[in-house]
């Protein structure tokens, strides 16, 4: 019995087609992805093949103005239109709190939303009961398939799930649910979830009875053969894991941002054993036309976005200096504003011993592309922020050793004076450079704000200590020559859309007046 699994993950509100790098579409003839194009391909496969499931492995939320404005209603609407069969909860589904998940998505979705390792307690338990499920048995042709969901247990550090949701260990939580499916005579089981490729592989290895793993969170690109675009495969598609009980379990993921549609064909025998598995992600490029009815619907929803981008978010009473003459040479107040917003967006009081789980921010000065003049009645709009942060990136959470941070700050000024983008703006860090010294030895003082303290204060950086840092995804991926970050990071979780982080902060503060205050000397 052959099953076709179509899958997406980490779409991050790319409802419209995007350019090849998943930023805003500029030249339509070269654009990719988007729900209208996705629908065309899904329908084509549904017509051609008998047993098809369309699955999403989480993080539909967060990433463009679509989410900022529609807050998840757009996800429910368009996923319903595409007739998704199931979705797993990702960490970003909690970005607007539990209410921001329940009202727009859980109550509106016409497909099951899954996670076996999230347990509700207290008053939330009855409110959320039945709105998401640990598993769902889906009829597919003459057969039935069990789908079990899972979500990163790091979600409380990455998003805002509140205090009434407990995130359990994925493997511990999944096993009893899979066992339950087996007792219901369901012998074809897909684990669909959002914990990253390493955990996907562990689930394939450790959870008895799971036949296929469809994952997300780590934006992993897998491909067999010559890849069709710029993404470099982390392995073959599907990636085969040998389980502890001796079965070959295919593990798949489909990069991110709706650029690809994962396409996996599985042949099962009567016992539910995977006899064969093969496929590849399908690049959703312009050779696939956008479905006209979905496209028309997108255009209708688009109108509200255009109105939103010119509305006032808040005010500044000072000039926000985002000029390259400042931000690539010295501390600039636009850099301070953005870093403060980045830390504020990551406030998570999850442990009494810590005032927060992260206190540090670094930001490449070259990523700040425009100032904002306060003399326009102080008004700040989304449009203004899009000029400052035009690349559509995210502000991510990483874990780095102190020694890696020291290398990063040395790199920040290794060719100082040439107006290059690697000069770092900071938050929660005091750095002193001596530019008379030779490159690689210019950082003379590096103090960082404590987290395990009730009164935050600055302490010298310890080389062997592991620190959490918020930074742009561009830096996490080694951009601007920060190869040491990419090579040495111990953990990387993608965060919220850069503009959204700053806009939320400005809206919260109402009036801002960031200063140059001696963070960089």
């Amino acid at each position: 019995w052959e099953l076709t699994i179509l899958h997406t993950n980490d779409v991050h509100s790319r409802l419209e087609q995007t350019s090849e790098d998943s930023s805003k579409c500029v030249n339509a003839s070269r654009c990719m992805g988007g729900v209208a194009r996705l629908f065309t391909k899904v329908q084509q496969i549904r017509r051609a093949e008998p047993n098809v499931l369309l699955l999403d492995a989480g993080d539909q939320y967060q990433g463009t103005i679509w989410f900022t404005v529609y807050k998840g209603a757009e996800v429910a609407h368009f996923m319903n239109a595409l007739r998704y069969d199931a979705m797993a909860l990702g960490n970003h589904e909690f970005d607007n709190g539990v209410e921001g998940l329940i009202e727009p998505l859980l109550k509106e979705a016409k497909f099951p939303i899954l996670s076996a390792n999230i347990k509700a307690k207290g008053p939330l338990a009855s409110q959320i009961s039945g709105l998401y499920l640990p598993y769902k048995v889906l009829p597919v042709g003459d057969e039935v398939v069990g789908i079990v969901g899972y979500t990163s247990k790091e979600t409380p550090f990455l998003s805002n799930p509140g205090t009434n949701l407990v995130f359990e260990d994925e493997i511990t939580a999944l096993q009893p649910e899979v066992d339950k499916l087996k007792t219901l005579n369901v012998n074809k089981i897909i684990a669909l979830g959002h914990s990253g490729f390493e955990m996907d592989k562990l689930i394939a290895q450790k959870v008895r009875g799971v036949d296929v793993v469809v994952g997300g969170h780590s934006n992993t690109f897998l491909y067999t053969g010559n890849p069709p675009s710029k993404e470099v495969p982390a392995g073959k598609y599907p990636f085969i894991v040998t389980s502890d009980d001796g079965r070959k379990v295919p593990v798949v993921q489909a990069y991110a941002f709706g650029k690809y549609l994962g396409y996996l064909k599985i042949e099962f025998d009567e016992r539910g054993n995977v006899i064969s598995s093969h496929g590849n992600p399908i690049l959703l490029n312009s050779s696939i036309p956008e479905d006209p009815s979905i496209k028309a619907d997108i255009n209708k929803w688009r109108i509200k976005l255009d109105n939103y981008s010119t509305q006032e978010l808040g005010k500044t009473i000072v000039y926000l200096d985002g000029s390259s003459q400042s931000c690539r040479f010295r501390e600039c107040n636009m850099g301070n504003l953005i870093c403060d917003a980045m830390i504020n967006n990551n406030l998570r009081h999850t442990d009494e011993m810590f005032w927060n789980h992260v206190s540090m921010c670094i930001l490449n000065g070259g990523g700040i592309r425009s100032p904002i003049d306060e003399r326009n009645n102080g008004t700040i709009t989304w449009e203004n922020l899009a000029a400052v942060l035009p690349f559509g990136g995210t502000f991510d959470l990483v874990q780095l050793k102190g020694s890696t941070l020291k290398k990063a700050f040395e790199h920040s000024v290794h060719r100082y004076g040439q107006s290059t983008g690697e000069f770092l703006q900071v938050g929660g860090i005091h750095v002193v450079y001596d530019l008379s010294r030779k490159p690689g030895d210019r950082v003379v003082k590096l103090d960082v704000l404590c987290t395990k303290c009730r009164v935050p204060s600055y302490d010298p950086l310890k080389m062997d200590e592991v620190y959490k840092v918020i930074l742009p995804n561009f830096l996490a991926n080694g951009g601007d020559g920060f190869q040491m970050i990419k090579d040495e990071l111990l953990r990387h979780d993608s965060g919220d859309q850069d503009i959204n982080v700053v806009s939320t902060y400005i809206s919260k503060m109402k009036v801002i007046y960031p200063a140059v205050e001696g963070r960089i000397k």
Partner: antibody, heavy 114, light 107 residues
Framework: EVQLVQSGAEVKKPGASVKVSCKAS????????MNWVMQAPGQGLEWMGR????????FYSQKFKGRVTMTVDKSTSTVYMELSSLRSEDTAVYYC???????WGQGTTVTVSS | DIQMTQSPSSLSASVGDRVTITCRAS??????LNWLQQKPGGALKRLIY???SLDSGVPSRFSGSGSGSDYTLTISSLQPEDFATYYC?????????FGGGTKVEIK
């Protein structure tokens, strides 16, 4: 649990036909196919062909083409294998086996003798 | 048709021995290979499917490996109940074909 139960032993004369049945249970019958395998006395296994339960599509091994007919009765989840123009070298045990031979019938002994 | 050459055709071994049986296909069969066990009474049982996946209930002393046209069944420590005849089966293309069998006997 998958179970395949075959019909009983048969003794046939050369030139006659034999029809062996295989009744399946414990799985969604229409979603799969059935193989038939022959084993002559003291010999190895030989694949004869297979039938798709849902629509009766068949694929026969060239060696048996023209003499073998596989049919299906979806209402009783039973598959049949008929072998015609029997000769002495058709004396063997005939097995039905699920799609990828994960489960086997107990075998049906067919003796061709004058 | 794809020919499956299985070797050895028979072997004598003692309890606790490591036993290896090989199957060579006349062309690439890309993982589409099963290993079957037939006890003297005639009952057939699949041990390994898709080259290396172990059927449920089959002891972990049985393992399968290989790719392309060369495949191996290994019994890491032979037990009394393992004395039987073993067959490989390719299902990469029609007609499916079996190896000639390997009879594992007590030394």
């Amino acid at each position: 649990e998958v179970q395949l139960v075959q019909s009983g032993a048969e003794v046939k004369k050369p030139g006659a036909s034999v029809k062996v049945s295989c009744k399946a249970s414990g799985y969604t019958f229409t979603a799969y196919f059935m193989n038939w395998v022959m084993q002559a006395p003291g010999q190895g296994l030989e694949w004869m062909g297979r039938i798709y339960h849902n629509n009766g599509d068949t694929f026969y091994s060239q060696k048996f083409k023209g003499r073998v007919t596989m049919t299906v009765d979806k209402s009783t989840s039973t598959v049949y294998m008929e072998l015609s123009s029997l000769r002495s070298e058709d004396t063997a045990v005939y097995y039905c086996a699920t799609s990828y031979v994960g489960d086997w019938g107990q075998g049906t002994t067919v003796t061709v003798s004058s | 048709d794809i020919q499956m050459t299985q070797s050895p055709s028979s072997l004598s071994a003692s309890v606790g021995d490591r036993v290896t049986i090989t199957c060579r296909a006349s062309q690439d069969i890309g993982d589409s290979l099963n290993w079957l066990q037939q006890k003297p009474g005639g009952a057939l049982k699949r041990l390994i499917y898709a080259t290396s996946s172990l059927d449920s209930g089959v002891p972990s002393r049985f393992s399968g490996s290989g790719s392309g046209s060369d495949y191996t069944l290994t019994i890491s420590s032979l037990q009394p109940e393992d004395f039987a005849t073993y067959y490989c089966l390719q299902y990469a293309s029609f007609p499916w074909t079996f190896g000639g069998g390997t009879k594992v006997e007590i030394k």
